[in-house]
Structure formats: structure tokens, C-alpha cells
């Protein structure tokens, strides 16, 4: 086909000789044809159409990519001739850097729907060169990691040695989708979530007297996990005293947040302190009530069949522990004023007498 009518874009890939990095070309088809072939995600800010016939990427027809040999030979089908270059919908991924990637790349729709579509193509002139050794040593990596739950930032490798003030306007894409919120050389992330993982592309324009080039870099961002540096945090009970009714059943819940640990051995126990005695109570198993990638909330309840006078003199202690350390929360029971009748008190005293006998034969010291 005749490529003279293709729109042209010039791109520069300055790769680091010290690291493995990838490169991506987007098939920036002119409107309105682009909307037939590429997902909205590949559009630049000025190219977003009112309507896209395909909203789900699985419905999208592909584009065909070619490479134009410098000697004027016929166009080469990239899939057949270049195993290190991968075609994926509307993008072309270069797995390995090298000056041999320099050349002209043409994309056009695979399915021609109208005579006008024949001229619907983009020619990308790609220049690939190693980064000069003069460029700064601490340039950002093409593989960047963000720690889940913390703050972080993604830096554009080709601009990471420049201050924000010096930096030109940058266009960012994530997984091919334009990120219109930021135009600086760094994306600041207030709190890292899994969705921040992906392939980021940063573009800026470099002009000389002769022409204008888009300088592009690709960053693979991973969200990573790490062990907490904090002891578990008791969320409930919050108060150190709890109003109760004598003779009535009572459940005290202990809820604690445990930060992520690769080897997770949470400990959650209930103790009772009575004068100089202290013992662990046999209570139902702890259960996880909320689990995320950065922490887990665990609950364990202590159940009293009926609150007795003796219970009012005791301290109920929730103890939680991880590999960093432990936290405790004590709860003292306090009788609700004006609650319960004479029968309740007699009943409670009867339970207390039975309980005294039971504890004398069963309690043990906790060290």
C-alpha cells in the first residue's frame, strides 16, 4: 500500500546501557478512523472522540504493523521478521533495546472498512541511541517498585535528573491510557494500591532548529509488599470500662489490626486478672473479619454466660502480638446503676459461689 499519505511522528528512545528496558509505540491513528480500531485508552488529549464503537478491548479489531527498510525494499511484516518485537492490539512492544531498532514503523487497520481507510495509517520514525555517559548516574530505573499502603512516586527515567522546575511538560500513559491529571516528570502517589501496578509511558517534546521529536521512556511499575514495622493495633474495646447488668450474658469483643507479615503468626488471647492471679481464658477461635493486601483485622470474643459480682472485681485483658511486639487492652466491668432486681442479684451470687469452687480447681498462673 502507498505510505506517502500516512501521518508522521518522530520518536526518540535513548536507552540505558546499564539496564534492561522495553519500549512501546502506540498506533496513533488519525480521527475518525482511530475510533474504529483502537481503544479509547490509546488516545491523546486532543483526540478523544465523542463516541467509540468498541468499548471493550476484546471487541477491538487489530492494527497491522510494518517496518520500512532503509534501502527502499518492500514493507516487512514485523511478526515474521522481528521476534523481539511484540504486536499487541494497538501497541508495538520492543523487548530489547539497541540501535538496530532504529527505523520507520507503520501501522494501519487490519480490516479496511471504506476506501478512505486505505490512507488511514501512521508512520513512526524511531531513532534509538544509547544514553550518553554524561547523563546523570542516578537516573530513575525503568523498573520501579511502590510499597503497598505507603506513599511513593513514579519518575520519568529520561527526566529524573532534572528538577521539577526545569522539567518540560510530560504526557503520561498507564497501560496505554492517557493520565491527564499530571504533566510533571514525577507522578506522586499518596497511598499505593494494587491498581498502581502497570506499564507507564512518559513522553516529552524535544525540539531543535530542524525538527521536533517525542522523547519516550517506558517504566514497569510493580506494587510490592513488605513486613509491617508496627505492633498490632487494638481497635476494640476502646474504653477501659464497660457498663454491664448483673446476671445477664455478656460478650466482649477484641478486634485488632495486624500489619502485613510474610510469615504471619498472629497471637490473640483473652486473660483474666483477679488480685494476684492471672489466667488465660478458653474462648472461641479468633476469626479474620477483614483482610486486605496490607493488613488484616482479627476478632476474638470472650463470652460470659452471666455477669457476677466477682466479674466486677476482675480485669479482662485482650493480648495481641506479632513478630514486632505486643499490645494489650484492659477492660473493667462496672454495674449499670438502677439495673436488675433482687432476683438477679441472688442469681448472680449463686453463680459466683459455683464459679469460686470451679476456679479454685482449674485456674493457673500465666507467665
Amino acid at each position: 500500500f502507498n505510505i506517502s499519505g500516512c501521518s508522521t511522528k518522530k520518536l526518540l528512545w535513548a536507552y540505558s546501557t546499564r539496564s534492561e528496558e522495553e519500549f512501546i509505540l502506540f498506533c496513533d491513528l488519525p480521527e475518525p478512523q482511530k475510533s474504529h480500531f483502537c481503544h479509547r485508552s490509546q488516545l491523546s488529549p486532543t483526540q478523544v472522540p465523542d463516541h467509540l464503537p468498541f468499548t471493550d478491548s476484546k471487541d477491538l479489531p487489530d492494527v497491522q504493523w510494518y517496518r520500512q527498510p532503509s534501502n527502499g525494499d518492500p514493507l516487512e511484516d514485523i511478526r515474521k521478521s522481528y521476534p523481539h518485537i511484540i504486536q499487541d492490539k494497538c501497541t508495538l512492544r520492543f523487548l530489547t533495546p539497541g540501535v538496530n531498532n532504529t527505523g520507520s514503523y507503520i501501522c494501519r487497520p487490519k480490516m479496511i472498512k471504506s476506501p478512505y481507510d486505505v490512507a488511514c495509517c501512521v508512520k513512526m520514525i524511531l531513532e534509538v541511541k544509547p544514553q550518553s555517559n554524561a547523563s546523570c548516574e542516578n537516573s530513575a530505573s525503568h523498573k520501579q517498585d511502590l510499597l503497598l499502603g505507603s506513599t511513593g512516586s513514579i519518575s520519568c527515567p529520561s527526566l529524573s535528573c532534572q528538577s521539577d522546575a526545569q522539567s518540560p511538560e510530560v504526557t503520561w500513559y498507564k497501560n496505554g491510557k492517557l493520565l491527564s491529571m499530571t504533566r510533571s516528570n514525577r507522578i506522586v502517589v499518596d497511598e499505593v494500591y494494587i491498581y498502581h501496578q502497570g506499564t507507564y509511558v512518559c513522553d516529552y517534546t524535544q525540539s531543535d532548529t530542524a525538527s521536533s521529536w517525542t522523547v519516550r521512556a517506558v517504566v514497569q511499575v510493580r506494587t510490592i509488599v513488605g513486613d509491617t514495622k508496627l505492633k498490632p493495633d487494638i481497635l476494640d474495646p476502646v474504653e477501659s470500662t464497660l457498663e454491664v447488668e448483673l446476671g445477664k450474658p455478656l460478650t466482649i469483643s477484641c478486634k485488632a489490626r495486624f500489619g502485613f507479615e510474610r510469615v504471619f503468626n498472629p497471637v490473640m488471647k483473652w486473660y483474666i486478672k483477679d488480685a494476684d492471679l492471672e489466667w488465660e481464658v478458653s474462648v472461641p477461635e479468633a476469626k479474620s473479619i477483614k483482610s486486605t493486601l496490607k493488613d488484616e483485622i482479627i476478632e476474638r470474643n470472650i463470652i460470659l454466660e452471666k455477669v457476677t459480682q466477682r466479674d466486677l472485681r476482675r480485669t479482662f485483658v485482650c493480648f495481641v502480638q506479632n513478630s514486632i511486639g505486643n499490645t494489650t487492652q484492659s477492660v473493667q466491668l462496672k454495674e449499670k446503676r438502677g439495673s436488675g432486681g433482687l432476683n438477679d442479684i441472688f442469681e448472680a451470687q449463686k453463680i459466683e459461689w459455683h464459679e469460686t469452687v470451679r476456679f479454685q480447681s482449674h485456674h493457673h498462673h500465666h507467665h
Epitope: 506494587t223 513488605g226 513478630s323
Partner: antibody, heavy 124, light 107 residues
Framework: QVQLQESGPGLVKPSETLSLTCTVS????????WSWIRQPPGKGLEWIGY???????NYNPSLKSRVTISVDTSKNQFSLKLSSVTAADTAVYYC??????????????????WGQGTTVTVSS | AIQLTQSPSSLSASVGDRVTITCRAS??????LAWYQQKPGKAPKFLIY???SLESGVPSRFSGSGSGTDFTLTISSLQPEDFATYYC?????????FGQGTRLEIK
């Protein structure tokens, strides 16, 4: 760009303590786990243990009684000490960055950056 | 400890061949398996994680599959630089363990 470099004596006497240090350059030691792995001559790989930059550790039970891994974040280094060595501890010792990659509802751990390895011979 | 058994222990193949290496776990490990490539005198290089996810920069001729106890590493068309020893590694439970390795040689 992260690079790891093991250092330490290449020869250790039996019953003594093997001490190695891994220096991390081109990146921070923070936020990552750091592992030690060894490979006896002509054999496969054996994981020794890891340390998180905050200091939490996990060791291979088969070596636990003899192993200590520590970290010095100010120097961007982590170290291995293996006590009471015998000829069976002769191996190439590697340090590696151990990453927990989060994806959907689980994690995948991989050793994505390795040192070039240092040979340690246990002999009198 | 979970044992990983690789087969074959060694194999000879030619450039352009399709090669499959298997790794069997002594108990179910979900998809918590990684593959590494090691060349003589060099440190291992990480290729695949989560049984089938390719590390960025690793050629697409490498692929991994499997879940539970049976896993495979496939090289669709061998290149000269692929001749090396390959190790599988499980992260499902501690201690972390490696397979004994599969040595891939030029025929």
C-alpha cells in the same frame, strides 16, 4: 540498576564462623526482603534465609540453629553468619533481592536481582 | 519441606527446537512457583513468576504453565543463548525450596 556484591573470606576453617556481607548499590535496601542462597559445587540451589530491611528474619529450619542474618540500612548492606562450619558448607554463596509482588488478592515472591556469588571453601 | 522434582535432569536439543521441562511438587503449591535460568559461573536469572507470568524483558519464547503440583517451562524455539540450567522454585510455604535443576545442552 540495582546491583549486589558479596564479600568475605574465601577460606574458613572447620568449626569456625563463616561471615559474608552483601552490599546493595544503585538502589535502596528499604522496602525489600534480602535473601542468602548457596550452591555446593556441581549441585542445586539451597535457600538459607531472608531478612526484611526492618530486621524481621526467616531461616531455613535445616540451618536455623547456625544462621544469623542482619541488616545495616545506613550502609545499604546485609550480612550472613554461619557458625560451626564443616566441609558440607563449602559452596558458592549468593545474595539476592527478594520481592513480594502484590497482584489481585495474593503475593508472588521472586528473587529478581542476584549478586555474582562468592566461593567459600571450608578446609583446615 | 516441599520437594520439587524436575524432569528430565538433562536434555540435548538443537537451535529452533521446542523444549519442555517439568517440575513436580510433593504437595499442592497453588501457583506459587518461579523459574530461573543459570549459566555456568553466573548467578541465576529470574524468568517467570506465579507459574506463568513472564518477567519484563524475558523473550516471549519462554512460557510457564501449571498449578497445584505439576508445572512446565516451555521454550518454543531454542536460541543459542538458551542453553543453560533451569531451576524451579516454590514460595508457597517455608522453607523456600528449589528443584534439582535441568541442564539443557546443545545436541
Amino acid at each position: 540498576q540495582v546491583q549486589l556484591q558479596e564479600s568475605g573470606p574465601g577460606l574458613v576453617k572447620p568449626s569456625e564462623t563463616l561471615s559474608l556481607t552483601c552490599t546493595v548499590s544503585g538502589g535502596s535496601i528499604n522496602n525489600y526482603y534480602w535473601s542468602w542462597i548457596r550452591q555446593p559445587p556441581g549441585k542445586g540451589l539451597e535457600w538459607i534465609g531472608y531478612i526484611f530491611y526492618s530486621g524481621t528474619t526467616n531461616y531455613n529450619p535445616s540451618l536455623k540453629s547456625r544462621v544469623t542474618i542482619s541488616v545495616d540500612t545506613s550502609k545499604n548492606q546485609f550480612s550472613l553468619k554461619l557458625s560451626s562450619v564443616t566441609a558440607a558448607d563449602t559452596a558458592v554463596y549468593y545474595c539476592a533481592r527478594d520481592v513480594g509482588i502484590a497482584a489481585r488478592n495474593s503475593y508472588y515472591y521472586v528473587m529478581d536481582v542476584w549478586g555474582q556469588g562468592t566461593t567459600v571453601t571450608v578446609s583446615s | 519441606a516441599i520437594q520439587l522434582t524436575q524432569s528430565p535432569s538433562s536434555l540435548s536439543a538443537s537451535v529452533g527446537d521446542r523444549v519442555t521441562i517439568t517440575c513436580r511438587a510433593s504437595q499442592g503449591i497453588s501457583s506459587a512457583l518461579a523459574w530461573y535460568q543459570q549459566k555456568p559461573g553466573k548467578a541465576p536469572k529470574f524468568l517467570i513468576y506465579d507459574a506463568s507470568s513472564l518477567e519484563s524483558g524475558v523473550p516471549s519464547r519462554f512460557s510457564g504453565s501449571g498449578s497445584g503440583t505439576d508445572f512446565t517451562l516451555t521454550i518454543s524455539s531454542l536460541q543459542p543463548e538458551d542453553f543453560a540450567t533451569y531451576y524451579c522454585q516454590q514460595f508457597n510455604s517455608y522453607p523456600i525450596t528449589f528443584g534439582q535443576g535441568t541442564r539443557l545442552e546443545i545436541k
